[in-house]
């Protein structure tokens, strides 16, 4: 238990910690605490073990609640004893009865408690504690009387509190010691005499506050605590609080005023009064500062200061402002040579400053005026705007040309120029509203910004902006497109040369729109075809004519495309379509997809009249069936000899169908040798079978070809080897490696490959390829489908 | 809602200087202190110093005048703290913290995440 | 300055239970004393000002008390979010300190 004396006053709580150490039992001690008055023997008093410990006396105390043990860990607890009294005066002995199975040590100990009467008392009493009303900068005392009557020696501790609302804090303390502790905020107003606590008397402790802030409104609490030395040791015997007074600071009056709106002519000057209005007239010193913002709300990020008198009366402007002062409640801003960039809104902002400790100074209060609405009034330029197309499109890549004019009744100024920004709108086709399209902006110093809509079309030159004369604006498109119809208007602006020599905006005056349109009928185009002599065997010639006929297409050419449409072998597969040949708009022939190369001269394609085109092809061949078209394209003429696609058309079908009923042919490997070692002759037969009809083996020829996947690239594409075609002429790919080939037709229908000295690189997989060449009744040779 | 966000990790070299910040937001910045917090891994926490935002005013745990220094801009409601001469010993977490009822009742409401610094060569 | 001991320096404790955690300012702060909750590599959090003030948001299992110099704080029917460390501050005069802090444990 503690050591020293506990010093209570009578009616305050007693608290007297115990805690045992240094013990081998149970980490959860057992207490039991005994009291003795003066000389007579210890009585149970409570025990956190057993119920019935405690004397009937303490039972009683125990049950109210006015005594009770608290367990503040395993190995302590703490005694408390509410309301003390006289005759809790004495001894009180802590014990633990159940700590060790061995004695080691002590096991109990005692500590003197002295009651006191209560001899503090603390003023003031009035009910309810006084209002007091002052304003920002006034100064305010508060008193607080604090005195003991005690026949020992105490000493008083005492703490000014302001409450505001909820909140509480600390404003200057005074300890048992004699020390001061200003409170959080407080340091600096303490240490430098604005804020003091002094005593008046031998029982008043005074608060002082030389310059009140805001922040000192509040609730006012004086709390004195008694402190008594026992064995060296100080020790709070009690603590009484009293509302002492309710601060309330009123705010400072302080009103700006200005005019609400001014007008003032160009190169004149504007002078400004702000007057100002406050209920201070103590030393209080203004702090005035004007500032200018385009819009009507000081507090935006653009506004700006044009001019500060600070609270020593020093000014500070920009140039061309001045600032003076006629007294002290009206301030003059002068703006000199004013121009149409001082056209916005004035605001001036007061600030009082009261002087503190130390030369410091505190603000007391500001305002800031309503906005003074500028006007600068300016000899604006008058001007007319006139628009009208010199050249209007009647087809689309026509050109079109605009000029805009400005008719100027006073243009013979020299700080006056005028620039052009182009607009196009669409035509409207309903109520829809469109929006204008900004094609070119010129600025002040004449630099011409495209607009999305233009940008690209310029740099490729196909829009000019341009300025002819002193007075016209021109705007011309080289090719007008459809997209380009619509409406197009010009705004002229005229700028004023400012005295920083750079140019504003004076005005903008718009033209009246011009229409650019042209009627639009869709190109019509249309293509027939037709064949001359429509029955015809394999061998003999196919003819088509196609004649071409367009509508609302400006000068047309045509270029003329022969497609044929392919059956494919299976029947689930869409037919396959091959270009053959070509003439284009300038009548040159271009072969397309015609890889015959035996029948080069066999296809042709020519212009019988300016609308009729006509398609030959000699020897057809069995493998030429299908359906024929013309893909016609109509090209109107742009700009010289280049052309535009105006349209493009496909002509009905016309089929050509041969009615055979030929043989079918099968091809297959075969190799004595599949399996050889190396430098042995590898020998593989191309074996080919006919079903069907029968031929004479002078009816039958055939294109060989031998390929292989070779055992070091299985996972690339075959390789051409050798070939061996219809009329017996062999053809053998370069080889890397040392072995031979030969290729020899051994029988009518069966071709044989040797690879003479094989090496590593010849094993792999082979694959013969067969085109079968069949002589038709009329002598001419059919090419049939490749077979694998 | 309020919100104090700090700035992100640093490494600084011994002797160096670094300047960390703090931006609040979702109340009126100028109303309420900004107090700055130390916390050394594994450690308690160490007071620096609050700064007012609405005239700038500071005050200083004296351990660390000369090593700290508080300001503030009010357009972009942030609190700038930085520190001076660094060595190993300021290696910790930095807080900034928002006074509970507006000015010095020097109790916090509102933490920033913090900032880690890592003075180190 | 003013110097906060807290006690103990760890404990731990089971879900449900009752904790007390004690905070000795070297001189009389009055009531000016604030308690925080950290968890591990977070800010700290506001749990009780003015000695037995609780903060906005703080569940009523909180509870402070004590003045002049002995204050404690009582955590009554632990949840499993009440681990971490807690640390007393005194908000009397410049400079506000902490104590060194009380790690609680899930037992």
């Known amino acids: 238990v503690p050591t020293a004396t506990l010093v209570r006053v009578v009616g305050t709580e007693l608290v007297i910690p115990c805690n045992v150490s240094d013990y081998d039992g149970p980490s959860e001690q057992n207490f039991d605490w005994s009291f003795s008055s003066l000389g007579s023997s210890f009585v149970e008093l409570a025990s956190t073990w057993e119920v019935g410990f405690p004397a009937q006396l303490y039972q009683e105390r125990l049950q109210r609640g006015e005594i009770l043990l608290r367990r503040t860990a395993n190995d302590a607890v703490e005694l408390h004893i509410k309301n003390v009294q006289p005759s809790d005066q004495g001894h009180y002995k802590c014990s633990t009865p159940s700590t060790d199975a061995t004695v080691q040590g002590n096991y109990e100990d005692t500590v003197q408690v002295k009651v006191l009467a209560d001899s503090l008392h603390v003023g003031p009493s009035a009910r309810p504690p006084p209002s007091l009303s002052l304003r920002e900068g006034e100064p305010f005392e508060l008193r607080c009387t604090a005195a003991s009557a005690s026949p020992l020696h105490t000493h008083l501790a005492l703490l000014w509190e302001v409450h505001r609302g909820p909140a509480r804090r600390s404003v200057l303390a005074l300890t048992h010691e004699g020390r001061f502790h200003p409170g959080l905020g407080y340091e600096q107003r303490y240490h430098s005499g604005d804020v003091r606590l002094d005593t008046v008397g031998s029982d008043a402790y005074r608060l002082s506050v030389s310059r009140a802030l805001s922040a000192d409104q509040g609730s006012y609490r004086c709390i004195v605590s008694e402190w008594i030395a026992e064995q060296g040791n100080w020790q709070e015997i009690q603590e009484k609080a009293v509302e002492v007074a309710t601060v309330v600071i009123q705010p400072s009056v302080l009103r700006a005023a200005v005019p609400k709106n001014v007008s003032v002519a160009e190169g004149k000057e504007l002078d400004l009064t702000c007057n100002i209005t406050t209920d201070r007239a103590d030393d209080v010193r203004p702090e005035v500062t004007w500032s200018f913002s385009r819009m009507p709300d000081s507090t935006l990020p653009g506004s700006r200061v044009l001019a500060r008198l600070d609270r020593d009366s020093l000014v500070h402007s920009s140039p061309h402002v001045a600032l003076s002062h006629v007294d002290a409640r009206s301030y003059h801003l002068l703006v000199r040579d004013v121009s149409k960039e001082n056209s916005g809104y004035y605001y001036c902002h007061v600030s009082l400053w009261a002087p503190g400790h130390n030369r410091s100074w505190h603000k007391v209060a500001e305002a800031v005026s309503s906005p003074a609405g500028v006007g600068v009034t300016w000899l604006e330029p008058d001007y007319q705007v006139y628009l009208n197309a010199s050249k209007v499109p009647g087809f689309a890549d026509d050109p079109t040309e605009l000029a805009c004019r400005v008719v100027d009744t006073k243009s013979g100024e020299a700080n006056v120029r005028f620039t052009v920004s182009w607009y196009y709108r669409m035509n409207r086709r309903s109520d829809n509203v469109v929006t204008s399209e900004l094609l070119a902006v010129m600025d002040g110093d004449w630099t011409l910004k495209y607009g999305e809509r233009s940008k690209q079309r310029a740099q490729d030159g196909d829009f000019i902006f341009s300025k002819e004369h002193t007075d016209t604006f021109n705007f011309r498109i080289q090719r007008t497109t459809e997209e380009d119809r619509g409406n197009y208007y010009c705004v002229v602006s005229a700028w004023t040369k400012q005295r920083n020599n750079s140019w504003v905006k004076s005005k903008d005056v718009f033209s009246k729109p011009v229409n650019i349109f042209w009627a639009l009928e869709d190109s019509v185009l249309v293509v027939k075809a037709r064949q001359p002599k429509p029955f015809f065997a394999a061998g003999n010639t196919f003819e088509m004519t196609c004649k071409v006929s367009s509508k609302n297409i400006k000068s047309p050419r045509y270029s003329v495309l022969i497609m044929a449409e392919k059956p494919v072998g299976d029947l689930s597969s869409p037919n396959e379509t091959k270009y053959i040949i070509s003439l284009d708009q300038d009548s040159v022939v271009k072969l397309e997809n015609w890889t015959d190369a035996s029948r080069v001269d066999g296809v042709v394609l020519e212009k019988v009249q300016e609308d009729e085109f006509r398609y030959r092809m000699y020897q057809t061949q069995v493998s030429d069936a299908g359906l024929y078209r013309c893909m016609v394209t109509a090209w109107s003429p742009v700009r010289g000899s280049l052309w535009r696609e105006a349209a493009t058309s496909l002509s009905n079908p016309i089929e050509i169908d041969f009615q055979t009923s030929g043989p079918i042919f099968n091809a297959s490997v075969h190799s004595d040798t599949p399996s050889v070692i190396r430098g042995d002759l590898i020998k593989l037969f191309c074996i080919i079978t006919v079903e069907g009809a029968a031929l004479d083996p002078d009816d039958m020829a055939f294109d060989v070809s031998w390929f292989a996947v070779h055992s070091f690239g299985l996972d690339k594409a075959p390789v051409l080897l050798s070939s061996l075609d219809r009329k017996g002429i062999v053809t053998t790919s370069r080889r890397d490696w040392k072995s031979d080939l030969s290729l020899e037709r051994v029988s009518v229908l069966e071709f044989l490959l040797q690879v003479h000295g094989s090496e590593d690189q010849d094993f792999g997989n082979y694959y013969c390829s067969v085109t079968p060449w069949v002589k038709s009744p009329t002598g001419s040779w059919q090419k049939e489908a490749e077979i694998h | 809602q309020v919100q104090l966000q700090q700035s992100g990790p640093e490494l600084v070299k011994p002797g160096a200087s670094v300047k960390l910040s703090c931006k609040a937001s979702?109340?009126?910045?100028?109303?309420?202190?900004i107090n700055w917090v130390k916390q050394r891994p594994g450690q308690g926490l160490e007071w620096i110093g609050w700064?007012?935002?609405?005239?700038?005013?500071?005050n200083y745990n004296e351990k660390f005048k000369g090593k700290a220094s508080l300001t503030v801009d009010t357009s972009s409601s942030t609190a700038y703290m930085e520190l001076h001469s660094l060595t190993s010993e300021d290696s910790a977490v930095y807080f900034c913290?928002?006074?509970?009822?507006?000015?010095?009742?020097?109790?916090?409401?509102?933490w920033g995440q913090g900032t880690t610094l890592t003075v180190s060569s | 300055d003013i110097q906060m001991t807290q006690s103990p320096a760890s404990l731990s404790a089971s879900v449900g239970g009752t904790v007390t955690i004690t905070c000795r300012a070297s001189e009389k702060i009055y009531s000016y004393l604030a308690w925080y909750q950290q968890k591990q590599g977070k800010s700290p959090q506001l749990l009780v000002y003015?000695?037995?003030t609780l903060a906005q948001g703080v569940p009523s299992r909180f509870s402070g008390s004590g003045s002049g110099t002995q204050f404690s704080l009582k955590i009554n029917s632990l949840q499993p979010e009440d681990f971490g460390s807690y640390y007393c501050q005194h908000h009397y005069v410049t400079p506000l300190t902490f104590g060194a802090g009380t790690k609680l444990a899930l037992k």
């Open positions: 913290a928002r006074d509970y009822y507006g000015s010095t009742y020097g109790y916090f409401d509102y």
């Open positions: 979702g109340y009126t910045f100028t109303t309420y202190d």
């Open positions: 700064l007012y935002p609405r005239d700038g005013n500071t």
């Open positions: 003015d000695a037995n």
